[in-house]
C-alpha cells in the first residue's frame, strides 16, 4: 500500500547503557479514525469528525505493524522479522534497546472497508540513541517502586535531573491511556494503591530550527509492600497439648506466617526436646500454601509412623525465623483415654 | 535471591517429545506455583502450565492431553514434558516463580518445532 499518505510523528529514545529498559509505540492513528478503533478516544461525543471515522472493528488487536527497510526494500510484517518486538493491541512493545531499533514503524487498521480508510494509518520515524548526558549520573530508573499505603511520586527519566521550573510541558500515559491532568515532569501520587502500577509513558516535544520530535521514555511502576518489622507468627498449632493414639501414625502440621521481605530466607523446622536433650528432626519440606503481596504462608509437617510411650514424654517444637526473629510453639502429645 | 535456571529446548520435528527442566536454587521452600510460560515472536507471554505446591495442575487449553508438568522436590526441579509438538508450539519457554505474589523468571530456553 502507499504509505505517502500516513500522517508522520517523529519521535526519540535515548536509552541507558547501564539498566534494562523497554519503548512503546502507540497506534496513533488521526483522531478520527482512532475513535471507532484504539478506543484512545479524545473527542467528545459533540465534537464532530472533519471526516468519516475508520470504519474498522472494535478488536484493539486489528492493526498490522510494519518496518520500512533503509534500503527501499518492501514493508516488513513486525510479527515476522522482529522477535524481540511485541504487538500488544494497538501498541508496538520493543523489549530491549539499541540504536538497531532506529527506523520507521507504520500501522494501518488489518480491514480497510471505507474509501477514507486507505490513508488511515500512521509512520513513525524512530531515532534510538545511547545515553550520552554524564551530568546527569542520577537519572530516574526505568524501574520505579512505590510503596504501597504511602506518598511517591513517578519520575520521567529523560527529564529528572530539570527542575519542574526548567520542565516542558509533559504527556503522560498509563498502560497506553492518556493521563490528561498530569504535566509535569513527575507524577505525584498522595496514596498508593494497588492499581498504581502498571506501565508509564512520559511525552515531550523537543524543536529545533528545522524540526520537531517527541521524546519518550517508559517506565515501569511496580507497587510494594515495605519490609515486614515483625518476626512470623505460627498460626498452626495452636494448641500446646495434642490427644492423640499410641500405635497409630500422626502428622502434625506447623503454619507460620511470615511479612514481606525484598531479601527472603525464611527459616520453618521441627525439633524434638527430651529431658536435657534437643535434636532437629529430618522432615518433608517445607512449602508455601499462600502467597500475597505481603504475606507467604509455609507449613513444614512432622511425621511419625507409629505414637509410642516414648512420645509421650517429649516436646515437639515448630521453629520459625526471618531477619527479624524467631517464634517456637511446642506441643505436647496426651494419650487418648477410652 | 531466586535463581531459575531453564534447559533441554532445541530443534525437533513436528510429532517429536522433548523435555524443558527449570533448577530452582536461593529457595529454601517449595514455591505455592510453579508455571511455564512461552512466548512467540511479536506475541505476549502466555501462560502454558502451572503446578501448585499441593501437586495440583493447570494447562493452556492448546497444550491439554500433550504436555505434562512436575516437580521433583528433592532437586528443586519443575520438568515439562511436551509430546506431540506442532509447529505452533515454536517460542521461548520460561520457567516462573510467584513469591509474595511477585513474578522471578528464568533466562527462557528456545523450543523450534520445524520439519
Known amino acids: 500500500f502507499n504509505i505517502s499518505g500516513c500522517s508522520t510523528k517523529k519521535l526519540l529514545w535515548t536509552y541507558s547503557t547501564r539498566s534494562e529498559e523497554e519503548f512503546v509505540l502507540f497506534c496513533d492513528l488521526p483522531e478520527p479514525q482512532k475513535s471507532h478503533f484504539c478506543h484512545r478516544n479524545r473527542l467528545s461525543p459533540k465534537q464532530v469528525p472533519e471526516h468519516l471515522p475508520f470504519m474498522g472493528s472494535n478488536d484493539l488487536s486489528d492493526v498490522q505493524w510494519y518496518q520500512q527497510p533503509s534500503n527501499g526494500d518492501p514493508l516488513e510484517d513486525i510479527r515476522k522479522s522482529y522477535p524481540h518486538i511485541i504487538q500488544d493491541k494497538c501498541t508496538l512493545h520493543f523489549l530491549t534497546p539499541g540504536v538497531n531499533n532506529s527506523g520507521s514503524y507504520i500501522c494501518r487498521p488489518k480491514m480497510i472497508k471505507s474509501p477514507y480508510d486507505v490513508a488511515c494509518c500512521v509512520k513513525m520515524i524512530l531515532e534510538v540513541k545511547p545515553q550520552t548526558n554524564a551530568s546527569c549520573e542520577y537519572s530516574a530508573s526505568h524501574k520505579q517502586d512505590l510503596l504501597l499505603g504511602s506518598t511517591g511520586s513517578i519520575s520521567c527519566p529523560s527529564l529528572s535531573c530539570q527542575s519542574d521550573a526548567q520542565s516542558p510541558a509533559v504527556t503522560w500515559y498509563k498502560n497506553g491511556k492518556l493521563l490528561s491532568v498530569e504535566r509535569s515532569n513527575r507524577i505525584v501520587v498522595d496514596e498508593v494503591y494497588d492499581y498504581h502500577q502498571g506501565t508509564y509513558v512520559c511525552d515531550y516535544t523537543q524543536s529545533d530550527t528545522v524540526s520537531s520530535w517527541t521524546v519518550r521514555a517508559v517506565v515501569q511502576v511496580r507497587t510494594i509492600v515495605g519490609d515486614t518489622k515483625l518476626k512470623p507468627d505460627i498460626l498452626d498449632p495452636v494448641e500446646d497439648t495434642l490427644e492423640v493414639e499410641l500405635g497409630k501414625p500422626l502428622t502434625i502440621s506447623c503454619k507460620a506466617r511470615f511479612g514481606f521481605e525484598r531479601v527472603f530466607n525464611p527459616v520453618i523446622k521441627w525439633y524434638i526436646k527430651d529431658s536435657d536433650l534437643e535434636w532437629e528432626v529430618s522432615v518433608p519440606e517445607a512449602k508455601s500454601i499462600k502467597s500475597t503481596l505481603k504475606d507467604e504462608i509455609i507449613e513444614r509437617n512432622i511425621i511419625l509412623e507409629k505414637v509410642t510411650q516414648r512420645d509421650l514424654r517429649r516436646k515437639f517444637v515448630c521453629f520459625v525465623q526471618n531477619s527479624i526473629g524467631n517464634t517456637t510453639q511446642s506441643v505436647q502429645l496426651k494419650e487418648k483415654r477410652g | 535471591d531466586v535463581q531459575l535456571q531453564e534447559s533441554g529446548g532445541g530443534l525437533v520435528q513436528p510429532g517429536g517429545s522433548l523435555r524443558l527442566s527449570c533448577a530452582a536454587s536461593?529457595?529454601?521452600?517449595?514455591?505455592?506455583?510453579l508455571g511455564w510460560y512461552r512466548q512467540a515472536p511479536g506475541k505476549p507471554r502466555e501462560l502454558v502450565a502451572s503446578i501448585s505446591s499441593g501437586d495440583s495442575t493447570n494447562y493452556a487449553d492448546s497444550v491439554k492431553g500433550r504436555f505434562t508438568i512436575s516437580r521433583d522436590n528433592a532437586k528443586s526441579t519443575v520438568y515439562l514434558q511436551m509430546n506431540n509438538l506442532k509447529p505452533e508450539d515454536t517460542a521461548v519457554y520460561y520457567c516462573n516463580a510467584r513469591i509474595f505474589a511477585r513474578d522471578n523468571w528464568g533466562q527462557g530456553t528456545q523450543v523450534t518445532v520445524s520439519s
Open positions: 536461593g529457595i529454601s521452600f517449595r514455591v505455592n506455583v
